[in-house]
Interface confidence: low
């Protein structure tokens, strides 16, 4: 019968033949008696077989990740007989990886939204990488993820490829951020190939900053002619945060006369100081009224950063209007 | 090689102001955050600031809000520090330091500081 | 009053490993990277351990840094004669929402 061993060529052999192993029939004697043949898909191109000996060699370079097995069969035919001495079987012959293959990552680009101030070990986005070389042989496959930039902000987890934060940041004073992973394979032993991707990682806005009156006293005048319902003037806060989340309401916190009212222009996010009742400039010729802004929409667990509204004090002028 | 050069020593009386300067080199001027350090004389060192020189933003320490501005020119990349209304116990060495780009990034590269005296 | 809290001096002799202690507390140290700066006399501060236990290139191997809890420590072997300087640590403060220095520890190195 046929005396089979296991076949391997390593792919990417430089050498212009590599010596795959032996045909050998056990009714072989060795007095060359014997030919050897070689047929299927890659006899007599990639592979070659040395017909009085059954000795197998690869001729060309293979590339396992192109095709990583080649299905043959042998033949033994007695020469002087002309006969088959084994009957033709079929065998394998496989190709070994060597690490040729850097990680890659397919899902490219990578672009993430975590809103700011997460806590540490927030999960900010998962990148994979993938390997053309073969998972069961060795550590060729296998790999490890680091971050090359991004640092202290986020942190990667080496065998998911999991992003998390790792410190606190602030959209305030920076709203987006590159973060530079790399995934090595070999699990990171000498020899390892890499490859790198980039992930933006925005931070989404929350409502960590109220909103601060720009002036802390306001002048405003009205004349005593007016009616009730008059803007006599606007007041302006601040709020470094964005969208909703600097959205405010005016409201008067201390007006003992009660003669005005402020209400919020939601488009400007100013405040209108309006004439609640008539004044009479003989009766009172000014006032003196303070007005508090907080923001519109303040989320249970924010509500340590809004704890004490802003306020400003308006001082209000009465033009006193000649009466007939 | 990177560098933070400041302006050169002043002497103020109680109630003036003074503006310090800090010209950068050797480096990107909007990559970096740029912060104020003081120590009066004999004593420990105590942050002032920080200033974003790319967004303007800026955050100042509590003890110094009302009274510290600080502020950047991009054509010179120069960032400006300055201090109002001065008492003696402002009295110190001003350092500018570079930050990183998050504000808890320790300071990498330090200005040679600049002396400012406040007496009558 | 510092809100991180360091000796304030410390003495050795040439050869030998001192240690600089630096307490604070969650809102600090607790909660943030811990760095250590050394000033030389007459000189601004120069960055000697960030991020807890990391050197900048230039700076000896004989300079380590840690971080427990609420406390850091700068350790110091081989002690030189051009070790003597102040030495300072420093961290963010996330309820001062700025940073905060340790008032410093002199380091005097006994011939």
């Known amino acids: 019968g046929w005396v089979w061993n296991q076949f391997f060529v390593p792919e990417e052999m430089n050498t212009t033949s590599h010596h795959v192993g032996r045909l050998r029939s056990d009714l072989d004697n060795g007095n060359n008696s014997f030919q050897y043949k070689l047929l299927g898909a890659g006899a007599g191109s990639t592979f070659i077989i040395d017909e009085r000996t059954g000795d197998i060699y690869a001729i060309e370079k293979l590339d396992r990740e192109e095709r990583s097995l080649y299905i043959l069969r042998a033949q033994v035919i007695d020469i002087t007989t002309g006969r088959a001495v084994e009957p033709e079987s079929e065998f394998v012959i496989k190709v070994s990886d060597i690490n040729d293959n850097e990680p890659k990552f397919l899902d490219e680009p990578y672009e993430a939204i975590v809103p700011e101030m997460s806590p540490e070990g927030t999960l900010v986005i998962q990148v994979t990488a993938s390997d053309a070389d073969d998972p069961s042989s060795g550590n060729n496959a296998r790999l490890l993820y680091s971050l090359l930039q991004g640092q202290p902000y986020f942190s990667v987890e080496p065998t998911t490829g999991v992003i998390r934060i790792s410190s606190k940041m602030d959209r305030e004073l920076q709203d987006e951020y590159w973060v530079i992973i790399q995934a090595k394979d070999m699990i990171g032993q000498p020899g390892a190939l890499s490859g790198t991707t980039s992930v933006l990682i925005k931070l989404s806005d929350v409502n960590d900053n109220k909103p601060i009156f720009k002036e802390s006293l306001y002048r405003l005048t009205v004349s005593e002619s007016a009616p009730t319902g008059t803007s006599i003037g606007t007041i302006m806060a601040y709020d470094n945060d964005i969208g909703e989340n600097a959205e405010m309401d005016y409201s008067i916190e201390e007006d003992d006369s009660q003669t005005f009212d402020i209400i919020t222009n939601h488009e400007t996010q100013e405040g209108i100081v309006i004439l609640k009742k008539k004044v009479n400039f003989e009766h009172q010729n000014h006032y003196g009224i303070r007005a508090k802004v907080k923001n519109h929409h303040v989320d249970e667990q924010l509500m340590k950063y809004h704890t004490e509204a802003s306020t400003t004090f308006i001082k209000i002028q009465v033009e006193d209007v000649d009466e007939p | 090689q990177v560098q933070l050069v400041q302006s050169g020593a002043e002497v103020k009386k109680p109630g003036a102001s003074v503006k310090v300067s800090c010209k950068v080199s050797g480096y990107t001027f909007t990559s970096y955050f740029i912060h104020w350090v003081r120590q009066a004389p004999g004593q420990g060192l105590e942050w002032m600031g920080i200033i974003n020189p790319i967004s303007v933003s800026t955050s100042y320490a509590q003890k110094f809000q009302g009274r510290v501005t600080m502020t950047r020119d991009t054509s010179t990349s120069t960032v400006f520090m300055e201090l109002s209304s001065l008492r003696s116990e402002d009295t110190a060495v001003y350092y500018c330091?570079?930050?990183?780009?998050?504000?808890?990034?320790?300071?990498?590269?330090w200005g040679q500081g600049t002396l400012v005296t406040v007496s009558s | 009053q510092s809100a991180l809290t360091q000796p304030p001096s410390v003495t050795g002799t040439p050869g030998q490993r001192v240690t600089i202690s630096c307490s604070g507390s969650?809102?600090?140290?607790?909660?943030?990277?811990v760095n250590w700066y050394q000033q030389l006399p007459g000189t601004a501060p120069k960055v000697l351990i960030y991020?807890?236990?990391q050197r900048p290139s230039g700076v000896p191997d004989r300079f380590s840094g840690s971080k427990s809890g609420t406390s850091a420590s700068l350790a110091i072997s081989g002690l030189q004669s051009e070790d003597e300087a102040d030495y300072y640590c420093a961290t963010w403060d996330d309820s001062m929402n700025g940073w905060v220095f340790g008032g410093g520890t002199k380091l005097t190195v006994l011939s």
């Open positions: 991020t807890n236990n």
């Open positions: 969650r809102s600090n140290i607790g909660s943030n990277f």
């Open positions: 330091a570079r930050g990183g780009i998050q504000l808890w990034l320790h300071l990498d590269y």
